[in-house]
């Protein structure tokens, strides 16, 4: 990537890390508003399996690990990348390394959840405070997950799918703050390792991920009125190990692993519509990549 | 019923190249992690290659990182290994195996040996 | 890496015999260990997986048990048909390594 100031510009959707062939280091942003790729500063350390999120204008990197021909190393690691000027700083690092971990921000704090060490699938959790660069664990989830997905809505944390060592899993469970207690809640029609989950307009959604025999492009969402999962229009291709977010009320599923190929691909969900379209292509095929998008 | 059976062996000279397959029936190589294992002739086990059927994330010894690739054709049902610069010391009974969840592998091949030599 | 030191590396036994094979892991590999057994000229077969639980259809007279980072096999009552080499492997971190072998032959 390159070392310069990345341009003032406003909503990007960034994505760090990754893995075709060897873990990756790469930092990119994408612009849906023109279509364009940013190349920025390079992560210090190759990841892929991490997580990304963004607290006060500032874009971290969470877990991972580093698959190289050089050896296999779980991470710890938490760094922080400031847009203005395009840097990267090593944070506090987690009590444990993460790989294929999920992230969700409630209240400027960071949640890591789950992921694995070697062959240890945690079911742990732990807070980051950014004002304070620590860490600090909470309740550990019913489950043990790695390749879960994480969101939040009204303040609660969900975990979402994952695989326990065993299984992979179409549970879901829900945190709470306020009590620091972990609830199970209704699961999914469908079983969902390494799942792209995010929220959007009052309702989580569970895109894609691997269900023990094969990648999967459908889509589902959970009302937490109703407290039902409902399917919704599959992704054009099937994937996990994906990366998501929300950009201007629409969902983006960047690139992952369909099986054969390291996809490139990026979809975008317009929920008025119910429909998936591709708009654009990552510079190249990759899957576990950290996704994150600039506050404005 | 399981069944692994690898072919693609032979005598090969030094710095050359050979690629192995893995032919399952019985089960998905899309639903397990496949690894390649060796065994020198009358020595011990070694752990090659392995692939993650979720990630398409491999794994390789540090003895063969950078030379060997492991691959699969889900639409085969099969799983290769591709060795390229190859040493005496590559030689071997190349085994294929599945990885059951617990990390161990429950279903071997009948095994194929290279022989690099010149 | 970690390495699994097995032992003995052979041993004479005689069929109806209680034979136990040892591996010491060089650090902490959790349960994350397994058991092969391998004939002559054949692939290995898994025998115990997570240090101590049997995969389906082996005998019951072989069983795993772990005390910290030693991991022992165990044969209660030799038969003729395990005469053989077992060797074990963690796989708790990468890359994963197996014990040299321990070749069970008959007295």
């Known amino acids: 990537g390159s070392m310069g100031h990345a341009p003032k510009v406003g909503r990007l959707i960034y994505t760090a890390g990754g893995y075709f062939r060897q873990s990756l280091s790469y930092l990119e942003a994408y612009n849906p508003s023109d279509g364009t790729w940013l190349d920025l500063a390079d992560l210090q350390v190759p990841r892929s399996g991490l997580a990304g999120c963004v607290v006060g204008g500032l874009l971290y990197a969470v877990g991972g690990r580093n698959n190289s021909p050089d050896g296999n190393t779980d991470s710890s690691a938490l760094d922080c990348y400031n847009p203005m000027t395009n840097q990267w700083s090593p944070c506090a690092p987690m009590s444990v390394p993460r790989n294929r971990i999920g992230v969700g921000v409630i209240d400027g704090h960071i949640y890591a959840v789950g992921g694995s060490h070697g062959c240890i699938h945690h079911n742990s959790v732990e807070r980051y405070e950014p004002e304070r660069d620590e860490w600090h664990l909470v309740a550990p989830m019913l489950t043990r997950r790695i390749g879960v997905g994480v969101a939040v809505l009204n303040r609660l944390l969900y975990a979402v799918g994952g695989f326990d060592g065993t299984n992979r899993l179409n549970s879901a469970e829900c945190y709470y703050p306020e009590r620091n207690e972990w609830r199970m809640i209704t699961a999914m029609n469908t079983i969902r390792s390494g799942a792209g989950v995010c929220v959007l307009h009052n309702c989580i959604y569970a895109a894609g991920g691997y269900d023990g025999q094969d990648q999967l492009n459908s889509v589902e969402r959970y009302d937490v009125e109703t407290e039902t999962w409902t399917f919704v229009a599959p992704m054009k291709h099937r994937r996990s190990a994906l990366g998501i977010t929300v950009h201007q009320g629409r969902i983006y599923v960047l690139g992952g692993y369909d099986g054969h190929t390291f996809l490139d691909s990026v979809e975008c969900y317009d929920p008025d519509t119910d429909t998936w379209s591709e708009v654009t292509r990552m510079t190249s095929g990759r899957s576990g990549v950290g996704v994150a998008v600039t506050m404005e | 019923e399981v069944q692994l059976v690898e072919s693609g062996g032979g005598l090969v000279q030094p710095g050359g190249s050979l690629r192995l397959s893995c032919a399952a029936s019985g089960f998905a190589i899309s639903a397990s992690s496949i690894h390649w294992v060796r065994q020198a002739p009358g020595k011990g086990l070694e752990w090659v290659a392995s692939?993650?059927?979720?990630?398409?994330?491999?794994l390789y010894a540090k003895s063969v990182a950078g030379r060997f690739t492991i691959s699969a054709d889900t639409s085969k049902n099969t799983a290769y290994l591709q060795m390229n610069s190859l040493r005496a010391e590559d030689t071997a009974v190349y085994y294929c195996?599945?990885?059951?969840?617990?990390?161990?592998?429950?279903?071997w091949g009948q095994g194929t040996l290279v022989t690099v030599s010149s | 890496d970690i390495q699994m030191t097995q032992s003995p590396s052979s041993l004479s036994a005689s069929v109806g015999d209680r034979v136990t094979i040892t591996c010491r892991a060089s650090q902490s590999v959790s349960s994350a260990v397994a058991w092969y057994q391998q004939k002559p000229g054949k692939a290995p077969k898994l025998l115990i997986y997570?240090?101590?639980s049997l995969y389906s259809g082996v005998p019951s007279r072989f069983s795993g048990s772990r005390s910290g980072t030693d991991f022992t096999l165990t044969i209660s009552s030799l038969q003729p048909e395990d005469f053989a080499t077992y060797y074990c492997q963690q796989s708790y971190s990468f890359p994963s390594t197996f014990g040299q072998g321990t070749k069970v032959e008959i007295k």
């Open positions: 997570s240090a101590s």
């Open positions: 692939i993650d059927p979720e990630t398409g994330e491999t």
């Open positions: 195996a599945r990885e059951r969840a617990e990390y161990a592998s429950d279903a």
